[in-house]
Interface confidence: low
């Protein structure tokens, strides 16, 4: 069966197409090509008679058709109007006709497509954008590429029914998606340039930088405002609500505290018409001055006044700290801070408080510390002390009294003697005092700041110094058991106590010792030899005491009964006789020896050599005391034998008068007396 093949079936405009007849019978007379689906002489393109090799163009021949003897039709430089059916009529030699119809389509060569948008500047997350692939051409297939990938399934992407329009929803900012469209027809494939969407957004809340507040006065302020925005935001600065300038940067040189405030940056998007603002508080701090401490009471009174120390000057946004003795203030019942720490109250301040206080001010740009302050605590006067307290005073000395009272400020001193004001000095000096200067000495201490007075009284006694006493006696040589002795302590003094010592012991009164005349006179009744003393008298008054030199009594006594030694009574003939006589006596007695009634010698010792029986007899020792007028004697009978001595009898003693011995004694006394004076 006769068929027609189109090579190619789809022909690009301007190209050529070859229509080939297949299964063409043998013995052909010729054939004729027609435009269209049927034989129509008016639409004949051309004919070919094989035998004559004659090709004849027909009325539908455009000059671009070429008929070949192999029953093919070549059409060159085709146009879209060439699209359609072409019919071949084959005429066999038996003049029987055979027909076949073929067709091809002519498509334009597609131009490079481009993308148009219904909204060149969509607003983020708000506007949908319709992207249309241009131009619109017949018989064209439209495809879309997103980021060089075929169109993904997404709720944000929607295609029109002809695929020519792509609608994009909810477009985020900074969407860098690349969109391309592709056009296809049977003869060409073309792809557009990529398109990205210019998404309008913002402004976001602007950020102000740097946020290096606080600032120090004298620095510069350079603030930059930035807000994410498309198109780029316009910026407006307001300070404390007042418009300043429309720049992204705000620069203020040499700022002062007055530049502190509320700095607002307003970002404006001219495309979206939106404004966003951010406020930052800029604080400019002045460099703090050196602080100083003021006090509500420069001179507090000890343990009474509270002192309020205030850190000056008061400055805004300043932190106040206190230092006590170079240590950070610690909790104490004596220290109290105000709420703002600017005031420190000190309670119960003791005297001599040397604590020093400093205050420190801090702000974010500076730290300063004051000079130290110490409190001048007023106190006193305490009870004054008067010195020296070496009363009593001796007449003729100098009186130099000093008064001192602990006090701040230093006390003023006033002296009163027996209630009469004397002088206003700390020292009271009286030279060469007398008894009349005795009295009540009062020192008054006065504190001019506290207004307080304190007094101390001391009694000053001035005495005349007692003389050294001495003892007078009515009898320096009293006789024992006979005389009474009167010892008198001299001199007489008023207001004086008299004291006696005997043998360095205080006098013990006995019936034989009597005191009289205010103890000034000591009477010894019937003295004994043991009353020799020594005797001392003392005088004393409240200021002094004096003691006499010792006095001893020369008590005369005796003589006592003498003793002859040795006691032997019998002697051998030819022996030496050596007798010694002793009698206790004051003064020492006069000794006399009588042998058988005859005065032999005035010695205490009797010596006879080579005694014989002739020396037998009564040996008498006589003692005589011229002072007492008393005498005493003892007789001893001595026997001399040619052999052993026989036992002898004890001697006989005699004393006093009324015997022969005594007469001899009296005669002897006269002789002694006579001898004593020659």
């Amino acid at each position: 069966q006769l068929t027609i093949e189109s090579r190619p079936f789809n022909v690009a405009e301007g190209k050529e197409v070859l229509l080939l007849a297949h299964n063409v019978s043998q013995n052909l007379f010729g054939y004729i090509w027609y435009k269209g689906e049927r034989v129509d002489a008016s639409r004949r393109i051309g004919s070919c008679v094989i035998r004559t090799q004659q090709i004849t163009p027909g009325p539908a021949h455009s000059g671009r058709e070429t008929i070949d003897f192999n029953a093919s039709l070549l059409i060159q430089n085709v146009t879209q109007s060439d699209t359609g059916s072409y019919t071949i009529q084959v005429i066999k030699e038996d003049l029987v006709n055979e027909e076949a119809t073929g067709q091809f389509r002519v498509y334009p060569e597609l131009p490079k497509p481009y993308i148009t948008s219904n909204n060149s500047n969509p607003i983020e997350d708000k506007d949908a954008v319709a992207l249309t692939c241009e131009p619109e051409t017949q018989d064209t297939t439209y495809l879309w590429w997103v980021n060089n990938q075929s169109l993904p399934v997404s709720p944000r992407l929607e295609l029109s029914s002809d695929n020519r329009t792509l609608t994009v929803f909810n477009i985020p900012r900074n969407d860098t998606t690349s969109y391309k469209c592709e056009t296809q027809n049977p003869v060409s494939v073309r792809r557009s340039d990529p398109v990205t969407l210019n998404v309008l957004y913002g402004p976001d809340a602007p950020t102000i930088s740097p946020l290096n507040t606080p600032y120090r006065a004298g620095e510069y302020l350079n603030l930059t405002c930035h807000a994410a925005s498309n198109p780029t935001a316009q910026y407006f600065w307001f300070v404390n609500g007042t418009f300043q300038q429309s720049t992204q940067e705000l620069f203020i040189p040499n700022i002062t505290v007055n530049n502190s405030g509320s700095y607002m940056c307003q970002a404006h998007n001219s495309a979206t018409g939106l404004n966003r603002t951010t406020v930052t508080a800029i604080t400019v701090y002045a460099e703090l001055p050196k602080p100083y401490i003021t006090s509500n009471n420069s001179n507090p009174i000890e343990d009474k006044d509270a002192v309020t120390l205030t850190c000056e000057p008061e400055t805004q946004d300043t932190t106040y700290l206190w230092w006590v003795n170079n240590q950070r203030l610690s909790v104490s019942s004596r220290l109290e801070l105000s709420n703002d720490n600017r005031t420190l109250t000190v309670f119960n301040i003791p005297r001599n408080d040397t604590t020093f206080y400093e205050c420190e001010t801090q702000n974010p740009v500076s730290v300063r510390r004051s000079d130290p302050v110490t409190l001048n605590v007023l106190y006193g006067p305490d009870a004054p002390t008067i010195s020296p307290l070496n009363t009593p005073y001796r007449a003729g000395e100098n009186l130099n009294l000093s008064c001192h009272a602990a006090s701040n400020p230093a006390a003023q001193y006033f002296w009163f003697v027996n209630g009469t004001f004397q002088q206003s000095t700390q020292e009271l000096f009286i030279p060469n005092i007398t008894v009349n200067n005795s009295g009540s000495y009062m020192c008054q201490a006065h504190n001019s700041a506290t207004g307080l007075n304190r007094t101390t009284v001391t009694a000053i006694t001035v005495y005349v110094e007692l003389p050294k006493p001495y003892i007078s006696s009515n009898n320096s040589n009293p006789i024992e058991d006979k005389d009474a002795v009167t010892l008198t302590c001299e001199p007489v003094a008023e207001n004086t106590t008299y004291l006696w010592w005997v043998n360095n012991q205080s006098l013990s009164v006995s019936p034989r010792l009597q005191l009289s005349n205010g103890n000034r006179i000591l009477t010894l009744l019937s003295v004994t030899r043991n009353d020799t003393g020594p005797y001392e008298c003392g005088i004393q008054n409240s200021e002094s005491a004096k003691r006499s030199d010792p006095v001893t009594l020369n008590v005369t006594y005796g003589p006592d009964t003498p003793i002859i030694s040795p006691p032997d009574l019998s002697y051998r003939s030819g022996a030496n006789l050596n007798l010694s006589c002793h009698s206790d006596s004051n003064p020492s007695p006069q000794y006399s020896w009588l042998i058988n009634g005859t005065l032999r010698q005035h010695t205490q010792v009797l010596f006879i050599s080579k005694i014989t029986s002739n020396n037998n007899g009564a040996y008498a020792c006589f003692v005589s005391n011229l002072a007492t007028g008393r005498n005493n004697s003892i007789v001893k009978n001595i026997s001399v034998s040619s052999g052993d001595s026989a036992p002898g009898s004890s001697g006989l003693s005699a004393s006093g008068s009324g015997s022969g011995l005594n007469d001899i004694f009296e005669a002897q006394k006269i002789e002694w007396h006579h001898h004593h004076h020659h």
């Epitope: 404390n240 609500g241 505290v257 007055n258 502190s260 405030g261 509320s262 406020v279 508080a281 604080t283 400019v284 001055p289 000056e312 000057p313 008061e314 805004q316 946004d317 709420n339 703002d340």
Partner: antibody, heavy 120, light 107 residues
């Protein structure tokens, strides 16, 4: 535009109480120290009380110490003065005033005032 | 407390005059001094602070000077709207105290 509007004034008997309010607008209230200043009829100005921007520091004139309390609510942009134990000598126009920004010193903005009359 | 003493207490002047008001502090307040203007029935208005700093919007005919204890407010050329009562105030710590005021009247 900065605005300070006082309210709460009126007639009160001696010993009574009042609470004054001051509503602020047109500026960042929380950044400004505030004070109350009063003016007795025909007399001069007398500072009454001060509060720092964040409310942590308050001061009072001796004449009102212990009777008046200053406070603020930055979330409501409002300043208050609680006045107790009122006396005849407290009669005055009470102004709220915003200090110059960043300063506890000069009074940059003033309200129109509210009259407090203490009388029996 | 720091006392502020203003002088004079009242002053008569004409438009165009140069006027000076003085304020004395009882102790050193460094430069912590402000000046206010008050018209009848109105709230005070800050003119000058820190002795010499002009508040925003205040005409330049107002100026301040001084330091320590003695301060001066000067109006270089009086305008009709300047007739009011003027107060000085120290802002050197609490209690903030005002001067007793100077009433500026038209002569």
């Amino acid at each position: 535009e900065v605005q300070l509007v006082e309210s709460g004034g009126g007639l009160v008997q001696p010993g009574g109480s009042l609470r004054l309010s001051c509503a602020a607008s047109g500026f960042v209230f929380s950044s400004y120290d505030m004070s109350w200043v009063r003016q007795a009829p025909g007399k001069g100005l007398e500072w009454v009380s001060y509060i720092s921007s964040y409310g942590g520091i308050t001061y009072y004139a001796d004449s009102v110490k212990g009777r008046f309390t200053i406070s603020r609510d930055n979330s409501k942009n409002t300043l208050y003065l609680q006045m107790n134990s009122l006396r005849a000598e407290d009669t005055a126009v009470y102004y709220c005033a915003a200090h110059y920004f960043g300063s506890s010193g000069p009074f940059a903005y003033w309200g129109q005032g509210t009259l407090v009359t203490v009388s029996s | 407390d720091i006392q502020m003493t203003q002088s004079p207490s009242s002053l008569s002047a004409s438009v165009g005059d140069r006027v000076t008001i003085t304020c004395r502090a009882s102790e050193n307040i460094f430069a912590y001094l402000a000046w206010y203007q008050q018209k009848p029935g109105k709230a005070p208005k800050l003119l000058i602070y820190n002795t010499r700093t002009l508040q925003s919007g205040v005409p330049s005919r107002f100026s301040g000077s001084g330091s320590g204890t003695d301060f001066t407010l000067t109006i270089s050329s009086l305008q009709p709207e300047d007739f009011a009562t003027y107060y000085c105030q120290h802002h050197y710590g609490t209690p903030f105290t005002f001067g007793q005021g100077t009433k500026l009247e038209i002569k």
